[in-house]
């Protein structure tokens, strides 16, 4: 099967790398614009320069292109706890991240929220907190994991999954009491 190419990809594939086919004259290959610039005017003819202009403040292009407009710089989303790691430049978008001792949770491909890394109180750190993953905790005996926190088995209701985790502990307590009475 031949992969389906969009019109733009079809046009580009006719020209060598780093060039694109002139939209009005398919016998002309124009040089693409460098990152940090955008296409102002197509090249007038073969071997002639493409008119590329630098992106204005607040916009960028991160790779060679023949875009008619630069892309708008992203803004870090304060309501999601995001902080700016590096500012937008003409050839690189804003880089957003989280504060120290926080991790990113991606709600979708292009939306993340910052949350505090779990401290594993009443448990031990099985895997340390990573940029995109919370700490993985292992709970001490008598505790179970709920929403990545170690909660006392005394808070375990029969209907919850914790019964499986807390049952051995409960049985142990009963066993100890029974053996102590003989």
């Amino acid at each position: 099967l031949v992969p389906h190419l969009g019109d733009r990809e079809k046009r580009d594939s006719v020209c060598p790398q780093g060039k694109y086919i002139h939209p009005q004259n398919n016998s002309i290959c124009c040089t693409k614009c460098h990152k940090g610039t955008y296409l102002y005017n197509d090249c007038p003819g073969p071997g002639q320069d493409t008119d590329c202009r630098e992106c204005e403040s607040g916009s960028f292009t991160a790779s060679e292109n023949h875009l008619r407009h630069c892309l708008s710089c992203s803004k870090c989303r304060k309501e999601m706890g995001q902080v700016e790691i590096s500012s937008c430049t003409v050839d690189r978008d804003t880089v957003c991240g989280c504060r120290k001792n926080q991790y990113r949770h991606y709600w979708s491909e292009n939306l993340f929220q910052c949350f505090n890394c779990s401290l594993c109180l009443n448990g031990t750190v099985h895997l340390s907190c990573q940029e995109k993953q919370n700490t993985v905790c292992t709970c001490h005996a008598g505790f179970f994991l709920r929403e990545n926190e170690c909660v006392s088995c005394s808070n375990c209701k029969k209907s919850l999954e914790c019964t499986k985790l807390c049952l051995p502990q409960i049985e142990n307590v009963k066993g100890t009491e029974d053996s102590g009475t003989t």
Partner: nanobody
């Protein structure tokens, strides 16, 4: 006690419009970022849109950008979702929720309102 009550769902033809509302109580609505999520039959939760407390710079999922508009009226403690140019793939139960704070789960969300897009 936090309460979120969605309304406005229903059956609509492709290309049609609906406006969902979410009445909030039990917390200071004007201080909270509010979220619309949806769940299509047999699918997981999908983040649709959210709006910060001041109503500025809302976020939209790529799948709804240019068709849906989120808004809020802090004086009425109400969140809205205007849905235009509806498609069959927008069929889902729509929930409003408070932006999570402690971790990546929803502590507070409504019972949902069903939107069915079909001819």
């Amino acid at each position: 006690e936090v309460q979120l009550l969605e309304s406005g769902g229903g059956l609509v033809q492709p290309g049609g419009s609906l406006r969902l509302s979410c009445a909030a109580s039990g917390f200071t609505f004007a201080h909270e970022t509010m979220v619309w999520v949806r769940q299509a039959p047999g699918r997981g939760l999908e983040w649709v849109s959210h709006i910060p407390s001041d109503g500025q710079d809302p976020f939209y999922a790529d799948s709804v950008k240019g068709r849906f508009t989120i808004s809020r009226d802090n004086s009425k403690n109400t969140l809205y979702l205007q849905m235009n140019s509806l498609r069959a793939e927008d069929t889902a139960v729509y929930y409003c929720a408070l932006l999570p704070k402690r971790g990546p789960w929803f502590d507070y969300w409504g019972q949902g309102t069903l939107v069915t897009v079909s001819s």
